[in-house]
């Protein structure tokens, strides 16, 4: 009796291992400012924290400025980007802004580049303001595959704020994919 | 033999059981527009309804303003906040607004106070125009200890839209600390 | 003694199966351009995709433009939503204009109709730029019951964004009533 | 520091018009809230017209609503108040007065404003 009983309690420890070691994977990555590009025209951003602050991943990888999955199924995925200009840094270029996010998922199976979601503004920052703020949320659920790579597009990169509570992305699991 | 199932199905009961007591927290808050600051610097909004209308709240504590965590765990936060004005409502001081939410965590233990997320936008809101609006979307995901606190910081709190689908912020736990 | 692990082997067996016919529902609805109601006023939008590209839908339904809830349970509801005008479509009708989303829930016991969530902005969209954009995005956490329907009504709906990065909406059960 | 100099004022018939200049230096005047106070002989001093800092949002006292328009220029760091349909209960000293915008409305008291002017005297007679 005791045997079957280590059975069945084993299997279910197996079970309880498995679940805890395939432990629902979440990411959530602040913008490393001290690597953004300039310009004002959309550039993949590849500089991220993944662990200081409210930086965290796990059962994930961050590799090459991007988000990479390890384990198939159903995430929801958000990012917030703040964009800021104060006079003091020098006069903008134009007025005239468009300041957007893309939220881009790759199959490196099938390499290609995908835009998950997109948010944004056409923004007038004119010269009689000293500062000029404007932010984007963006979030949604989707089925990602094992080795499916997401990464964050922006306009205006310059423009970014870099704290880590402005400028952020991220992603945990909800369920399996049946 | 039937002691030794009672004894498995027992266990796992307790198992059920407890997970049932400590079933996911979550809340919902929605702004209490009967008690809501004056003047147009940041200051932190403290009363929300959690038991009436969309607002709800459960393992977890509303109290002095403040959401309190009773579980460990991984929680995705969030926050809308929407700011509107009539001019039938007055003449406003200044047509350059900084429109800001902050969704701050304070530990009693480390008395201290972080910003988690933030969002918002300069506008320019004329006196041509009669009714101006603008909203913001904030969320992450965060982890957070029992004990910690999680309060939210505008600025501009009497151009807040008192509408409970308006004006609220949330948070639902998502998986355990490992 | 067979049998009596059988037994306890079934009985989690059925619950396992059982867990998995009653799955997390979800559901991802992308806009379905191709019928896009016209005019500035506040309308309800009864196109969406539910299973192509991005769109998809499990343990929900998708009737007659509203999205139908078929399981108890707590959900997190989010929409996203951009308007976007070109000259080259044309002049506006206006510069001032009321940019909205409404998430609603109606209730078919109690034919009534209340919103969860809105977000949106005043935009003044001058004829000396080509080009205007904007994003909206909302989303909060509710206690939805079998039979309740969520949909989704805008304010200028001939300037959606027809992409399906752009214009979504969607929901994803977190944890049962208890 | 912060300067406020009133001008404009004098003597005029009743139903008659004036129009006061208030000159500003020392600040960021396009970053400030400006009002105009008045002060008659044995009265206290009362919000008569506020305007914001882009000056699209003006507010007055209701006394003066459609005889007064406040405005400003801020080119030349200057608010106005043009006085018109003056009558003898208009006898005051005006103030010009500044402040940072505190509020997100246009603030109407005396204890809202950080900055004033001396004042300049205005007499309506009969």
């Known amino acids: 009796i005791r045997a079957e009983k280590a059975m069945v309690d084993g299997s279910w420890l197996d079970l309880a291992k498995r679940s805890k070691l395939e432990a629902q994977p979440f990411a959530h990555l602040t913008i490393n400012a001290t690597d953004i590009p300039s310009g004002s025209h959309k550039v993949s951003l590849s500089s991220w924290y993944h662990d200081r602050g409210w930086a965290k991943i796990s059962n994930m990888t961050f590799s090459n400025g991007k988000l990479i999955v390890n384990q198939d199924g159903f995430y929801y995925l958000y990012a917030n980007i703040c964009f800021r200009h104060h006079e003091t840094s020098g006069d903008l270029a134009t007025e005239y802004l468009q300041l957007m996010v893309y939220v881009t998922k790759t199959s490196i199976k099938i390499p290609s580049s995908h835009t998950l979601m997109k948010g944004g503004s056409t923004k007038y920052w004119s010269g009689n303001s000293e500062f000029h703020f404007y932010s984007i949320n963006v979030g949604g659920f989707f089925k990602l595959r094992s080795g499916e790579e997401i990464s964050i597009e922006v306009s205006n990169p310059s423009l970014l704020d870099p704290d880590q509570d402005a400028t952020y992305f991220g992603a945990f699991k909800v369920r399996d994919i049946d | 033999i039937r002691a030794e199932k009672a004894m498995v199905d027992g266990s796992w009961l307790d198992l059920a059981k407890r997970s049932k007591l400590e079933a996911q927290p979550f809340a919902h808050l929605t702004i209490n527009a009967t008690d809501i600051p004056s003047g147009s610097h940041k200051v932190s909004l403290s009363s929300w309804y959690h038991d009436r209308g969309w607002a709800k709240i459960s393992n977890m504590t509303f109290s002095n303003g403040k959401l309190i965590v009773n579980q460990d765990g991984f929680y995705y936060l969030y926050a809308n906040i929407c700011f509107r004005h009539h001019e039938t409502s007055g003449d406003l001081a200044t047509e350059y607004l900084q429109l800001m939410v902050y969704v701050t965590k304070t530990s009693i233990k480390i008395p201290s106070s972080h910003t988690l997320m933030k969002g918002g936008s300069t506008k320019y809101w004329s006196g041509n125009s009669e009714f101006h609006f603008y909203s913001i979307n904030v969320g992450g995901f965060f982890k957070l200890r029992s004990g910690e606190e999680i309060s939210i910081e505008v600025s501009n709190p009497s151009l807040l839209d008192p509408d409970q689908d308006a004006t609220y912020f949330g948070a639902f736990k998502v998986r355990d600390i490992d | 003694i067979r049998a009596e692990k059988a037994m306890v082997d079934g009985s989690w067996l059925d619950l396992a199966k059982r867990s998995k016919l009653e799955a997390q529902p979800f559901a991802h609805l992308t806009i379905n351009a191709t019928d896009i109601p016209s005019g500035s006023h506040k309308v309800s939008l009864s196109s969406w995709y539910h299973d192509r590209g991005w769109a998809k839908i499990s343990n929900m339904t998708f009737s007659n433009g509203k999205l139908i809830v078929n399981q108890d349970g707590f959900y997190y509801l989010y929409a996203n939503i951009c308007f976007r005008h070109h000259e080259t479509s044309g002049d506006l009708a206006t510069e001032y204009l009321q940019l909205m989303v409404y998430v609603t829930k109606t209730s078919i016991k109690i034919p009534s109709s209340h919103t969860l969530m809105k977000g949106g902005s005043t935009k003044y969209w001058s004829g000396n730029s080509e080009f205007h954009f904007y994003s909206i995005n909302v989303g909060g956490f509710f206690k939805l019951r079998s039979g309740e329907e969520i949909s989704i009504e805008v304010s200028n709906p001939s300037l959606l964004d027809p992409d399906q990065d752009a214009t979504y909406f969607g929901a994803f059960k977190v944890r049962d009533i208890d | 520091e912060v300067q406020l100099v009133e001008s404009g004022g004098g003597l005029v018939q009743a139903g008659g018009s004036l129009r006061l200049s208030c000159a500003a230096a020392g600040y960021t005047f396009r970053a400030y809230v400006m009002g105009w106070f008045r002060q008659a002989p044995g009265k206290e001093r009362e919000f008569v017209a506020g305007i914001s800092t882009g000056g699209t949002w003006t507010g007055y006292v209701d006394s003066v609503k459609d005889r007064f328009t406040i405005s400003r220029d801020n080119t030349k760091n200057t608010v106005y108040l043009q006085m018109a349909s003056l009558k003898p209960e208009d006898t005051a000293v005006y103030y010009c007065?500044?402040?940072?915008?505190?509020?997100?409305?246009?603030?109407?008291?005396?204890?809202?404003?950080?900055?004033w002017g001396q004042g300049t005297q205005v007499t309506v007679s009969s």
């Open positions: 007065a500044a402040t940072t915008p505190v509020t997100s409305y246009l603030p109407r008291s005396e204890r809202q404003y950080e900055h």
